[in-house]
C-alpha cells in the first residue's frame, strides 16, 4: 500500500563509466519499522511466485551480507534515522537501468524504483546564460552538471576562447534527496570585445584531465564601436582641397540604426551616412570632427579628428599693449594675422618705413621715447604666401612737459613791497599743458596761464619755482628773487654781565638784527632821544645808577632803517643818601608825638630798617618810621637810621631831637 510508505530520492541519478553514484534516500513507514532491505538491479515481479526477481546488489540480513561480487555497493542508511542512502563505486555502464529498493516491515512491503543512467563517457555540463548580455553589466554564467559523488572528485573550469577565465567562480554541490548536481557560477562584466567569443565550461577529474565540456557563444549587446578614417590620410589640408571622412563601424550589436556627424560638438545638417565629404574646404571648416552612430543599446561617438585647413595670412592688424604709452614705459607690439600654418616671418613698419631686425610676431620697446610715436603696421608670411598689410595702429607717446624754465619779467633789483611778475616756459609737452603749479604756494594772482604776479613782495620771498603740468608736472629750477629789504629783527641784547647789573659793574649792550639785504649796515644808540654811539656795542666801564634808563638802537642799510624796541637798563645799588626827616620839626613838646622817617635811595628798595641813638644804642624799632608817643624830655638827643637791601647797607647822619617841657610842667615847678 503506497499510502503507508513515503520514500524521498532524486528520481534519476546520472553517472559515467568508472565514476560512482551516491543515492541520497530517506523513508518513512507508517506501520512499524523496516525489517528487510534488498537492493535489486532491474527487478521484475514474478506473478506466479508473488515476488521480485533480479540481480541482488545488496541485502540487509541480520549479518548485513552483500551478495558476492557486489562489494562496490554500499548501503549507507540505517533503520534508526530512516536513511536509505546508498552508493555504488565504481559504477559501470551496465549498471544503467532501475535500482529497486525492496523494503519490508512487519506488515507492509514496498518496491521503490530509482533510475540510474550511466553513460560510456562523462556527459557534458550545461552552460546557462542570462537571456541578455550587455557590455559592462555584470552577469552570472552557470555551469551545471547533474552529477556529484563523495567518492569521485571533479572540478568545473571556465575558459574564454580556450584560456582560463580570470574571474573567480563559486562552486557548489548538492547531494540531497531533491537533487544531485555540481554547479559553478561565474560572475563577470562582459565587454564588447567578448561578443562572438566562445565560453567553455570544462569538467576535470582529480588529476586535471578534461572529461567533457560545454560551449556557448557570447552574444554581448553593445553600442557601436567606431574608428574614423580621413582620405587623403592627412588631416592638414589646404584651402580649396576636398576631404572625405569615413566612419568605420568595427562592431555593433545589434546593427546600427542612425549615423550623424558633429563638428566641434555641433551636429552637421543632412549628414547621415558613414561617409562625410567636404568639397573645397574653407578656413571655417577647421575643427574637430566625429561621427555618432546609434543602435538599440545606445549612441556611440568616435574619436575626434582635428581637421586643419591651411591658408595664407589674412590682412594684419597691430595690437599695442598700451596707447597712449608713457615715455619710459615698456610697450609690446603684436602682429595679428590669422593663418594656418602659423606665420614663420613678420615684417614690421613704423610710419610706413620697415623696422630693421624685427621678424617676430611680437616685439618690445623696453623704454619708449617720444620719437617712437606713429603708425605701426606689419606683414605676416607663411608657406602659402605673404598676407596683406593692414592699415596700422597709432602709438601715442605721452610725456611730461620738457625743459621747463622760469623768467622774472621785472627790472631788478626787487625791493620788499614791490610787485613782481614771473613767467613759466617749456619746450614741448604731450598732452598739452593744462595747468601750472607754483612753490611756495601763496595768495598770488595768475593773470594768465603760466604767469604769476606777486604783489607787495615779502622780504622772505627768496626763491620761487614753477611747474608746467599735463598728466604730470615738470618743475623748473627755483629762481632766487634777491629781494632787498631794511634790517629786520633789531633788538638790544645785554652781553655782560651775565647776571643783574650792580652799580660799578662793567656793562656791554649789543645791537642785534636777524637779517639785512644788503648786508652793509650802520648802528646808532639812543637814550631818551640822545645819540650815544655808532658802534654795534655800547659799553659802560663802571655803571652808575644814573646810567639806568630806556635805551634803543637803530640799524640802517641802503633800503631803510629799523629801530629796536626800547630796552630798560636797571642798575642795582645799596641804600644811599639816607637821612632822617621829622615831619613836626626838630623841637617837640613833651607829651606830643615825635615821628622820625628814614628816607633813602636804593635799588632794589630797602627791605629792613634799624634805628640808633646818640650812644649808638639800637632802638627796638625796625620800620621806616620811628614813632615816639608820648614824647618825653628824656628822648632828647641825636638819632640815626640804617637801611638794608640785598645789595648792601647804608646809614644816615645824626639828627638832633629836642623835647621841651610843657607849660603844665613848668607851672608845677
Amino acid at each position: 500500500d503506497s499510502s503507508k510508505w513515503n520514500i524521498e530520492h532524486p528520481g534519476t541519478i546520472y553517472a559515467w563509466e568508472g565514476a560512482c553514484v551516491w543515492v541520497p534516500c530517506t523513508y518513512r513507514v507508517l506501520d512499524g519499522a523496516l525489517e528487510t532491505f534488498i537492493l535489486f538491479h532491474n527487478p521484475e515481479y514474478n506473478q506466479n511466485m508473488s515476488k521480485f526477481e533480479g540481480t541482488r546488489l545488496y541485502e540487509s540480513t541480520k549479518d548485513g551480507k552483500v551478495p558476492s561480487g557486489q562489494k562496490r555497493v554500499q548501503f549507507l542508511g540505517n533503520k534508526i534515522n530512516n536513511n536509505c542512502t546508498l552508493s555504488i563505486h565504481p559504477v559501470h555502464v551496465n549498471d544503467s537501468g532501475q535500482l529497486g529498493l525492496r523494503m519490508v516491515s512487519k506488515t507492509e512491503k514496498w518496491m521503490e524504483r530509482i533510475h540510474l543512467n550511466v553513460s560510456e563517457r562523462p556527459f557534458p555540463p550545461r552552460i546557462q546564460l542570462p537571456p541578455k548580455l550587455q557590455e559592462s553589466q555584470e552577469v552570472t554564467l552557470t555551469c551545471l552538471l547533474n552529477f556529484s559523488c563523495y567518492g569521485y572528485q571533479i572540478q568545473l573550469q571556465w575558459l574564454l576562447e580556450g584560456v582560463p577565465m580570470r574571474q573567480a567562480a563559486v562552486t557548489s554541490t548538492s547531494l540531497s534527496t531533491k537533487s544531485v548536481f555540481t554547479r559553478s557560477e561565474l560572475k563577470f562584466s562582459p565587454q564588447w570585445s567578448h561578443h562572438g567569443k566562445i565560453v567553455t565550461c570544462e569538467l576535470h577529474d582529480v588529476d586535471g584531465k578534461v572529461l567533457s565540456e560545454d560551449m556557448v557563444q557570447l552574444n554581448v549587446k553593445h553600442t557601436p564601436k567606431l574608428t574614423i578614417e580621413v582620405t587623403p590620410n592627412e588631416t592638414i589640408v589646404r584651402k580649396g582641397d576636398s576631404v572625405t571622412m569615413t566612419c568605420k563601424v568595427n562592431s555593433s550589436n545589434p546593427e546600427y540604426t542612425t549615423v550623424s556627424w558633429l563638428k566641434d560638438g555641433i551636429p552637421l545638417k543632412e549628414q547621415n551616412t558613414l561617409m562625410l565629404t567636404l568639397h573645397e574646404v574653407t578656413k571655417s571648416q577647421t575643427g574637430r570632427y566625429c561621427c555618432r552612430v546609434s543602435n538599440d543599446v545606445g549612441p556611440a561617438t568616435s574619436e575626434k579628428v582635428f581637421l586643419q585647413v591651411q591658408y595664407a595670412p589674412e590682412p594684419s592688424r597691430v595690437q599695442i599693449s598700451q596707447s597712449p604709452a608713457v615715455e619710459g614705459s615698456e610697450v609690446n607690439f603684436l602682429c595679428i594675422s590669422p593663418a594656418n600654418p602659423l606665420p614663420t616671418n613678420y615684417t614690421w613698419y613704423h610710419n610706413g618705413k620697415e623696422v630693421q631686425g624685427r621678424t617676430e610676431k611680437q616685439f618690445q620697446i623696453q623704454k619708449i621715447l617720444p620719437w617712437h610715436a606713429g603708425t605701426y603696421s606689419c606683414e605676416a608670411e607663411n608657406i602659402l604666401g605673404i598676407g596683406e598689410r593692414g592699415p596700422g595702429t597709432e602709438l601715442d607717446v605721452q610725456y611730461p612737459p620738457k625743459k621747463v624754465t622760469m623768467v622774472i619779467e621785472n627790472p631788478t633789483p626787487i625791493r620788499e613791497g614791490d610787485t613782481v611778475t614771473l613767467s613759466c616756459n617749456y619746450s614741448s609737452s604731450n598732452p598739452i599743458v593744462n595747468h601750472y603749479e607754483w612753490r611756495p604756494r601763496g595768495a598770488w594772482e595768475e593773470p594768465s596761464l603760466g604767469v604769476l604776479k606777486i604783489q607787495n613782495i615779502g622780504w622772505n620771498n627768496t626763491a620761487v619755482a614753477c611747474a608746467a603740468c599735463n598728466n604730470w608736472c615738470s618743475w623748473a629750477s627755483p629762481v632766487t628773487l634777491n629781494v632787498l629789504y631794511a634790517p629786520r629783527g633789531v633788538r638790544v641784547r645785554k652781553i655782560k654781565p651775565l647776571s643783574e647789573i650792580h652799580s660799578g659793574n662793567s656793562v656791554s649792550l649789543q645791537c642785534d638784527f636777524s637779517s639785512s639785504h644788503p648786508k652793509e649796515v650802520q648802528f646808532f644808540w639812543e637814550k631818551n632821544g640822545s645819540l650815544l654811539g655808532k658802534e654795534s656795542q655800547l659799553n659802560f666801564d663802571s655803571i652808575s645808577p644814573e646810567d639806568a634808563g630806556s635805551y634803543s638802537c637803530w640799524v640802517n642799510n641802503s633800503i631803510g632803517q629799523t629801530a629796536s624796541k626800547a630796552w630798560t637798563l636797571e642798575v642795582l645799588y645799596a641804600p644811599r643818601r639816607l637821612r632822617v626827616s621829622m615831619s613836626q620839626g626838630n623841637q617837640v613838646m613833651e607829651g606830643k608825638t615825635a615821628t622820625l622817617t628814614c628816607e633813602s635811595d636804593a635799588n632794589p628798595p630797602v627791605y629792613s630798617y634799624a634805628w640808633f641813638d646818640w650812644n649808638n644804642q639800637s632802638l627796638p624799632y625796625s620800620g621806616r618810621m620811628l614813632r615816639l608817643e608820648p614824647v618825653k624830655v628824656q628822648h632828647s638827643g641825636a638819632y640815626w637810621c640804617q637801611g638794608t637791601n640785598r645789595v648792601g647797607k647804608g646809614h644816615s647822619p645824626l639828627i638832633t631831637l629836642t623835647v621841651y617841657y610843657s607849660p603844665q610842667t613848668i607851672g608845677r615847678r
Epitope: S136, P164, R166, S189, G208
Partner: antibody, heavy 119, light 106 residues
Framework: QVQLKESGPGLVAPSQSLSITCTVS????????VHWVRQPPGKGLEWLGM???????DYNSALKSRLSISKDNSKSQVFLKMNSLQTDDTAMYYC?????????????WGQGTLVTVSA | QIVLTQSPAILSTSPGEKVTMTCSAS?????MYWYQQKPGSSPRLLIY???NLASGVPVRFSGSGSGTSYSLTISRMEAEDAATYYC?????????FGAGTKLELK
C-alpha cells in the same frame, strides 16, 4: 589617477557595529568592482567581500551573516558595515580595486584604516 | 574554499642572491597573484595572471607555475626587497591569500 581612501571610527566597543567608507577617484564605481580586505595586527590578509559595478555583492561565507557592502556611485563612495564586533575583528581594513573591471589582482589599494575593538 | 600554503614562512638571504618562494593550492587554480607588503604600508601587486609583471615592478621579480603549484622568484636580492610576500587565488570564491613568506636580509 586611481585612488582609494578609507575612513573609519578607529575604536569600536565589543558587540557594536562598524561602518567604514571608501572614497574613490580616477574611475567609475558603475564599471569597476571594489573589494574589502582586512589584516589583523602581525597577521595575514583576509578577503571580506566585494561589490560589483551593477551593485550586486559577494561575501566571504565565514562572515556573510555579519557583513553588508553598499555604495553611492554619485558620491564615489563604497560602504562596509559589520555587526557584532569582537576583539578578534581588530584589524587594518583596506578597500581595493582589481587590475581589470572584475579580476586581475588588486592593483590599487587604499592606505587602510585601523579598527580597534576594545571596551 | 581554496587553501593556499606558502613556504618557507621565513626566508633569510643576502643581497645579490637568488630567492624563490612557493605557494601550494589545495585544489587547481587558474592563475596566481603575488603581493609585496612592507611594515606600515598597504600591499602592492607584484605579479598578475601567474607571470605578468605589474606596473613599476622591477624585472628581477618573476612568477611561474600552474595547477596547484606556483612560485615567485627574485633573480638578485636587493635590500629594498625585504618584506612579506603573499600569494592569492582568483579562481574560486571566497578569494583567499596565503599566510605569507617573510623575506629578511641576512
Amino acid at each position: 589617477q586611481v585612488q582609494l581612501k578609507e575612513s573609519g571610527p578607529g575604536l569600536v566597543a565589543p558587540s557594536q557595529s562598524l561602518s567604514i567608507t571608501c572614497t574613490v577617484s580616477g574611475f567609475s564605481l558603475s564599471r569597476y568592482t571594489v573589494h574589502w580586505v582586512r589584516q589583523p595586527p602581525g597577521k595575514g590578509l583576509e578577503w571580506l567581500g566585494m561589490i560589483w559595478g551593477g551593485g550586486s555583492t559577494d561575501y566571504n561565507s565565514a562572515l556573510k551573516s555579519r557583513l553588508s557592502i553598499s555604495k553611492d556611485n554619485s558620491k564615489s563612495q563604497v560602504f562596509l558595515k559589520m555587526n557584532s564586533l569582537q576583539t578578534d575583528d581588530t584589524a587594518m581594513y583596506y578597500c581595493a580595486r582589481p587590475h581589470d573591471f572584475d579580476a586581475g589582482g588588486f592593483a590599487y589599494w587604499g592606505q587602510g584604516t585601523l579598527v580597534t575593538v576594545s571596551a | 574554499q581554496i587553501v593556499l600554503t606558502q613556504s618557507p614562512a621565513i626566508l633569510s638571504t643576502s643581497p645579490g642572491e637568488k630567492v624563490t618562494m612557493t605557494c601550494s593550492a589545495s585544489s587547481r587554480v587558474n592563475y596566481m597573484y603575488w603581493y609585496q607588503q612592507k611594515p606600515g604600508s598597504s600591499p602592492r601587486l607584484l605579479i598578475y595572471d601567474t607571470s605578468n609583471l605589474a606596473s613599476g615592478v622591477p624585472v628581477r621579480f618573476s612568477g611561474s607555475g600552474s595547477g596547484t603549484s606556483y612560485s615567485l622568484t627574485i633573480s638578485r636580492m636587493e635590500a629594498e626587497d625585504a618584506a612579506t610576500y603573499y600569494c592569492q587565488q582568483w579562481t574560486s570564491y571566497p578569494l583567499t591569500f596565503g599566510a605569507g613568506t617573510k623575506l629578511e636580509l641576512k
